[in-house]
Each structure stands twice: as structure tokens, then as C-alpha cells.
Interface confidence: low
């Protein structure tokens, strides 16, 4: 049988000799040469010789575990003579012994890693890792220690699993943003005699919100014109934070002060300042200065800090209203007045008031616009404002007026205000009453007396308080042996009555009637109106058939019967129906 | 990037529970007051509650529709948000956001939203 | 409850049209109003908050303004990504939205 025990043989050999592995023996072999020795398998004749008289295996060339850390070969032991083996083919190993030939090599050459400024002490930042290729089974070539070359105080690693963790207090990023730390991984648990590499890592604090936002003055000053509009900007404040990114982020408010309501601040999101705009109109003759108490303060806050104290930060911001000149101003935004009809040339209606807002209170002089009274019905003093008239009124024609009145500055022209003006001119009983329209009517030559033929009625240009009150009558002359009558039935309207049975035509074919109508206003105005009666034949039944030789004839012009498209009072129809009549000739 | 990410949504009969997440990422949710709001199909938008952060003692308000059968909670160390919603009605039937609340009280990030349909 | 009550309800506009929405709340809010953009099927986006702060990243075209109950958002030229609907909102004394605006294609 086969004799030997499994070969070991040290990697990296430096000798200049062949390196002794070990010897193939056979309990068959008797020493005298009849056996012969052969060595096949992994490197056989290359890497590993065998002398086929003795078994001695040599290694020819100097072996890296770490490349091949075990051999496999087939060992043979032939009888010379006979050509046979003496011992069944065997498989044997070498393995291959370590050295620590390797240092510890970092899976990165350089580690970027960040971590919050202000980080409780050990804080975890980042892991490094180290590999040694030597037998981590064998010895201590490949257990590495971690440790810390350059970045204390404020940092340590963990000398077994390579872990970085803050180990200082307090490390403001404000102060200082970066660390570079400088890692070792020493093989042979770091005893003297290891092997050892080395690594970057280039750590950056992140941001956190631990400083307040600052005014770098604890008074601002701006001027604005009293003319701003809502919206104007008039300055910019800023506060600084040493911070970045959101935590350096400023919300701008105003937290008190007298202007308030008159102001506003608003954050410019690029520059983080705040702007301070006009909020309502400004009058520098009311108020000339503002002082605002502006209040700036972070919008993402972290807790944690608050110890720290309120992170916000005022400032008092004066603000110096500048006057411009304004144009003068009246005392209302309209004026109504009002005058009778029948006013006298130059009566006075009433004035208006304008004055200078500005502090000077520049002299005013006024005047009307012409655009809005081409008539010149009315003028102003120039002086007090007193609006008089220049020409009769009449409220017939125009009830309202609407005129406008300009203030000038005296010693600035380029200043002016206009206002409106409404004068409403007032009724006065300037109008007689008369007719609503021409009267022509007929009676029948058979008509029987007190019968109602024609109804009439008034219209008034004026327009009384009380409303229309007419009286109508048969004028004087008229009156006595009239052989009609007039019947005031008190409503405003009056009827013609007939005031004997029967008229014949051929004796009087027509009768002009003189109304008089009256109002009861004052003074009393009246006019007379005169209404055409015509006698005409009827049938028995009230029908017009002639009356002379001529048709009647409507206001309009159109030859009507008496009906329906002439309209008699309805107690006409009593005596005959609607019917259109025949020329005569 | 600030991300606000809500799931659990899904069809539940009425008088039924339903339990919504809201996952935030790229800030310090510990740090903010979280609301949730909702929006009724082809509706407005409406503010259910909020909660605050652990500073202010993480105090809950609800609106009056919701109050006695809703419940907001945190978990901080998983950065997530939870609604609790009991005794669903089919009024209840919206599109669920969750949305930070940021400093001068407006909401400046949201969730893309969760459907809740309350149906028998 | 503090009510809002936007208007109008819906607008057509063109783009480069300037468009206005107002809000107003049932009793004064400070400057505590907040305005949305929402798109269908979007959540909402902040754009103006504490009634005249733009949101960072917002485009300087929009505006916004008022105090105390009355406010507005005015678009100074509409874009073709501007049209949606447009929420209000108060954070005074808890919250409330206004009904919305839907700002349409003329």
C-alpha cells in the first residue's frame, strides 16, 4: 500500500533551490530500483517533479495560494520489469501553506459619505470595508483592524466592522463644511509585523436649521412718494442666515407698528428679501411718517433647536411719506342743486368748494366747462364757487342739467379737479291747459235735448305737486242763449250737452263753441279752445247720412265716420251705430 | 425631492373601515404637521385633519363631518402618515390627499391621492 | 365655520388674456389665503400663499393680493398650461376651500 501522509508546501518560496514537497512510497518497494515512480494531475512535470527512483516530489516554481491554494495529483508505481502498476492508481493533494503576503486593499479608493451638522456623538456617517486575500482560516493574515490616520477629534471608526461615527460635539457646518478622514485596515488583528492600506473618505456636513435669520440693522428707512399706488414697492430689507438651502429660507411680516394697515411685506422667493409695498393710498397731509416693526423669521424650523432661542429676528423700518402736489380737492364727489323755472337772470343756485390737500393750500379759482354748457345757461364766481344763472330757464324744455365745474390752483393751472354738477330746475304753473285734440263733432237734426255728444278732455305742459286740477265752461260770450252746454263733471274731463230737441241745418249747419279751460294753480292759467259742432241728417235710427255739403273731417286729414274710427263718448251709440258716410256734393 | 406618497384606498360598503398610508420622503417628517384633505368626484376640495409633530405634541383636529369617526396617527421612525376611517358613508366617497403643512399655514407638497369609493 | 366664496364660478380666456378670480371670506382672515392650481386628475399645487407670497418655482405671472376678507389672484398673460381649476383657501381658523374656478379655452 501507498505510504505517505498529505504534502503542505509554503507558498512564495524564495529559495534558489527546488523546494522539497514531500515522498511517494510504496510498501512494495524494496529499494533496489525495480519500482519506478509516476506523478500526473495538476502541474505534474511542470510545477511538481517526482524522482521515479526514490518518489521525492519537488516544486519547481514558487506557488501563490492566494492564485491556487491546493494541488490535486495522481500518483502511479510501476514494476520495471513486468510494466505493471504494484499499487492501484492514488489521488493525492498538496495544499498550499499561507503567507501574509497581502495587505488589506478598501473597496473604494476614496468614500464620499455626509451627515447632519450638529450630529449627537456617534452618529453614524458611513462603512468602510477592507478585504485581505490571505487565508482568513489560517492565522492572522487576514483578520484587518480599522483605525482612524487623520480626522480626529471628529470622527472615530470602529476598529472591527470599519464604521465612521461623529466623535465631536456640536460640529457646526457654518464653522467648517468639510472632513477628509484618512482610514487604515492593518492585517494580523494590527499587531506589529501586519500588513495594512489605507483609504480617503471625504465627508460633508449637511445643513440643519440651528441658526435664526439676523437683520444686519435694527433700522431701515425708505421715502414714497403720498402718490403710490396700492402695490408700489418702496424698499428692500434683508436678513441674513447663515444657513442654506430651505433652512436659510426668510418669511418677511409685519408684527405691529402704526402703518400696519398701510403697508405691506412681501418675500421675494429668488433674493430671500422682503419688499415693503404701499398697501392703501398714502396722504402726507394725514400722516407723514410710518414706523412699521418688520418681523423675519425661518418657515422650516426644527425643534430641536429651539433651545437655541425664536428663530426670527424685527427690525423697525421708518417709512418717510414725501408730498407730491395734488390737485385741489371738493368737498363732495357730486352736488345737486335745484331753482325754479321763472328765476331771474344772475339768481344764485348754490356754490361748491374745492381745496388745495397740499400743505401750501394753494388758492383755487373756478370755472365751468364749457363742453358740458354750450348754452352758457349757467356761470360760477370764480372765486367762492357760487353757481348762478345767465339765462332763463325753462323746465318744459329740460327738466335736468348736468353741468361740470373745474378747480384750478391759481399758481399751478396744471392742478385741477372737476366735479359734476346736477341742477334740477323746478315746476312753476307757466302753462295754460288745453285741448288733448282737435274737437269736430255732429249732432242730429231730431236730437232730443241734454244728450251728450262730444266728451273732452285737457293737457298741461306743467307738472304740479298736486297734480292737474281743470275747470272747463262755455266762455262768457258764449254762454248766454247758447243752444249747447258744457258739463264739467270734475275729473279733468267735460262733456257738450245739447240744450234743445231738434236743430236744422238749413237754418245753422254748424256752431263754434268757445271752451274755456282753466288750472288751479298759481297764478291761475287758462286758454280758450273752440269745438266744431255740425248739424246733420240722420236716419231713425241715428244714423249720419249728410250734413251740408261736406264730409267730416278728422284732425288727421281722413274722412271719417262718426264711430268707431271717429271716437264719439260712448253715449253717442245710444243714438247711432258707427257707419262711414257718403260724400255730398 | 419631497415625495408624499398615500395607498390603502379601495371599494368598502357603508358603515365599513378602510385604513390609508401616506409615505414621505426627502425631508425630516418628524419636523412638520401633516393634514389630510379629500375631493368628492368632480367636487371641491375638502379639509378632513391634521396632525402635528412630535414638538407640538402630535395634537389632532378633524373637521365636523369626519370628528368621532376618523383617526389620524403617525409613525415617525417609518415616516409614515395613517387615517383610520370608521363607520364609512357613501359621502365619504372621494380622492384622499395627504399634504405638508408648511410654515404661515398653507400646504405646500401633496400626494398624488387615493381613491376611497363607499358603495354597496 | 369661516365660508369662501369664489368668482365666478367658470371663466373662458384666451392666452395672453389677464385673468382675475377673487375670494371672499364670511369674516377677516389676516393674510392667511392661499391659492391652488389643481389639473384633472393632479393633486393640487401651491402657488400664492399668505394672499400675496408666490411659491417657489411658480411663474412670476401669477399674482396675489387683498387682506383682511377680500382677495385676488389675477394671471397677468394666461398660458396654454395655465387653464384649470383654481382653489382658494384659509388657514386663519382651520381650514376651508373656496368652490373653485374652472378657467376654460375661449
Known amino acids: 500500500s501507498w505510504m505517505w501522509n498529505q504534502f503542505f508546501l509554503l507558498e512564495e518560496y524564495t529559495g534558489s533551490d527546488y523546494q522539497y514537497v514531500g515522498k511517494l512510497h510504496s510498501d512494495q518497494d524494496r529499494g533496489d530500483g525495480s519500482l519506478k515512480y509516476i506523478l500526473s494531475g495538476d502541474g505534474a512535470g511542470d510545477l511538481f517533479i517526482i524522482n521515479e527512483n526514490t518518489g521525492d516530489i519537488q516544486a519547481t516554481k514558487r506557488l501563490d495560494r492566494e492564485e491556487k491554494p491546493v494541488y490535486i495529483l495522481r500518483a502511479q508505481a510501476i514494476n520495471r520489469r513486468t510494466g505493471r502498476p504494484v499499487e492501484p492508481e492514488s489521488e493525492f493533494i498538496i495544499k498550499i501553506h499561507d503567507i501574509n503576503d497581502n495587505e488589506p486593499i478598501f473597496t473604494k479608493d476614496v468614500y464620499t459619505a455626509t451627515v447632519p451638522e450638529m450630529a449627537d456623538v456617534g452618529t453614524f456617517v458611513v462603512q468602510v470595508t477592507a478585504t485581505d486575500a490571505d487565508d482568513p482560516t489560517y492565522g492572522n493574515s487576514a483578520k484587518v483592524v480599522y483605525s482612524i490616520l487623520q480626522g480626529q477629534p471628529y470622527f472615530s471608526v470602529e476598529s472591527e466592522t470599519g464604521i465612521i461615527k461623529t466623535a465631536l460635539l456640536n460640529m457646526d457646518r457654518e464653522n467648517r463644511e468639510q472632513y477628509q478622514v484618512v482610514i487604515q485596515a492593518k492585517d494580523m488583528g494590527g499587531q506589529m509585523g501586519g500588513l495594512s492600506g489605507t483609504t480617503t473618505v471625504n465627508i460633508t456636513l449637511t445643513d440643519v436649521n440651528d441658526n435664526p435669520p439676523r437683520f444686519p440693522q435694527s433700522t431701515y428707512q425708505f421715502k414714497t412718494p403720498e402718490s403710490s399706488p396700492p402695490g408700489t414697492p418702496i424698499g428692500r430689507i434683508k436678513a441674513s442666515d447663515a444657513d442654506v438651502g430651505e433652512n436659510a429660507e426668510i418669511e418677511y411680516s409685519i408684527t405691529d407698528g402704526e402703518g400696519h394697515d398701510m403697508f405691506d411685506v412681501i418675500t421675494d422667493q429668488e433674493t430671500q428679501e422682503g419688499i415693503i409695498t404701499v398697501k392703501k393710498l398714502l396722504d402726507f397731509e394725514k400722516k407723514r411718517v410710518y414706523t412699521l416693526k418688520v418681523e423675519a423669521s425661518n418657515p422650516h424650523i426644527e425643534p430641536r433647536f429651539l433651545y437655541l432661542g425664536p428663530f426670527k429676528d424685527s427690525a423697525t423700518v421708518r417709512i418717510v411719506v414725501d408730498d407730491v402736489d395734488e390737485p385741489p380737492v371738493f368737498s363732495k364727489l357730486a352736488y345737486i342743486l335745484q331753482i325754479r323755472e321763472d328765476a331771474q337772470i344772475n339768481t344764485t343756485i348754490g356754490s361748491v368748494a374745492a381745496q388745495d390737500p397740499d400743505a401750501a393750500r394753494n388758492p383755487v379759482k373756478y370755472s365751468v366747462d364749457r363742453h358740458t354748457d354750450m348754452d352758457r345757461i349757467f356761470n360760477i364766481d370764480s372765486g367762492n364757487g357760487s353757481i348762478f344763472t345767465s339765462k332763463l330757464l325753462d323746465r318744459e324744455t329740460l327738466l335736468w342739467h348736468n353741468i361740470t365745474v373745474i378747480a384750478t390752483e391759481i399758481n399751478n393751472p396744471k392742478q385741477s379737479s372737476r366735479v359734476p354738477l346736477y341742477i334740477k330746475v323746478l315746476d312753476v304753473n307757466d302753462n295754460a291747459p288745453e285741448f288733448a285734440e282737435f274737437y269736430e263733432t255732429f249732432v242730429c237734426e231730431k236730437a232730443k235735448a241734454d244728450q251728450l255728444i262730444q266728451t273732452l278732455h285737457a293737457v298741461d305742459k306743467d307738472d304740479p305737486y298736486s297734480g292737474h286740477q281743470f275747470s272747463f265752461s262755455l266762455a262768457p260770450e258764449a254762454a248766454s242763449g247758447s243752444n249747447f252746454t258744457i258739463q264739467d263733471n270734475k275729473d279733468n274731463t267735460a262733456g257738450i250737452l245739447t240744450r234743445k230737441n231738434g236743430y236744422n241745418r238749413h237754418e245753422m249747419s254748424t256752431y263754434l263753441l268757445p271752451v274755456v279751460i282753466s288750472d288751479n294753480d298759481y297764478p291761475v292759467q287758462s286758454s280758450t279752445g273752440t269745438v266744431t259742432v255740425r248739424v246733420c241728417a240722420c236716419d231713425h235710427h241715428g244714423n249720419m247720412q249728410s250734413c251740408h255739403a261736406e264730409a267730416l273731417i278728422h284732425p288727421t286729414g281722413l274722412s271719417t265716420g262718426a264711430g268707431s274710427e271717429f271716437r264719439h263718448d260712448s253715449g253717442l251709440n245710444d243714438i247711432f251705430e258707427a257707419q262711414k258716410i257718403e260724400w255730398h256734393e | 425631492q419631497v415625495q408624499l406618497v398615500e395607498s390603502g384606498g379601495g371599494l368598502v360598503k357603508p358603515g365599513g373601515s378602510l385604513r390609508l398610508s401616506c409615505a414621505a420622503s426627502g425631508f425630516t417628517f418628524s419636523s412638520y404637521a401633516i393634514s389630510w384633505v379629500r375631493q368628492a368626484p368632480g367636487k371641491g376640495l375638502e379639509w378632513v385633519g391634521f396632525?402635528?409633530?412630535?414638538?407640538?405634541?402630535?395634537?389632532?383636529n378633524y373637521a365636523a363631518p369626519v370628528k368621532g369617526r376618523f383617526t389620524i396617527s403617525r409613525d415617525d421612525s417609518k415616516n409614515t402618515l395613517y387615517l383610520q376611517m370608521n363607520s364609512l358613508k357613501t359621502e365619504d366617497t372621494a380622492v384622499y390627499y395627504c399634504?405638508?403643512?408648511?410654515?404661515?399655514?398653507?400646504?405646500?407638497?401633496w400626494g398624488q391621492g387615493t381613491l376611497v369609493t363607499v358603495s354597496s | 365655520d369661516i365660508q369662501m366664496t369664489q368668482s365666478p364660478s367658470s371663466l373662458s380666456a384666451s392666452v395672453g388674456d389677464r385673468v382675475t378670480i377673487t375670494c371672499r371670506a364670511s369674516q377677516t382672515i389676516n393674510s392667511y389665503l392661499n391659492w391652488y392650481q389643481q389639473k384633472p386628475g393632479k393633486a393640487p399645487k401651491l402657488l400664492i400663499y399668505r394672499a400675496s407670497n408666490l411659491q417657489s418655482g411658480v411663474p412670476s405671472r401669477f399674482s396675489g393680493s387683498g387682506s383682511g376678507t377680500d382677495f385676488t389672484l389675477t394671471i397677468s398673460s394666461l398660458q396654454p398650461e395655465d387653464f384649470a381649476t383654481y382653489y382658494c383657501q384659509q388657514g386663519d381658523s382651520s381650514w376651508t376651500f373656496g368652490q373653485g374656478t374652472k378657467v376654460e379655452i375661449k
Open positions: 396632525i402635528k409633530s412630535n414638538a407640538d405634541g402630535y395634537t389632532t
Open positions: 399634504a405638508r403643512i408648511r410654515y404661515f399655514r398653507n400646504w405646500d407638497y
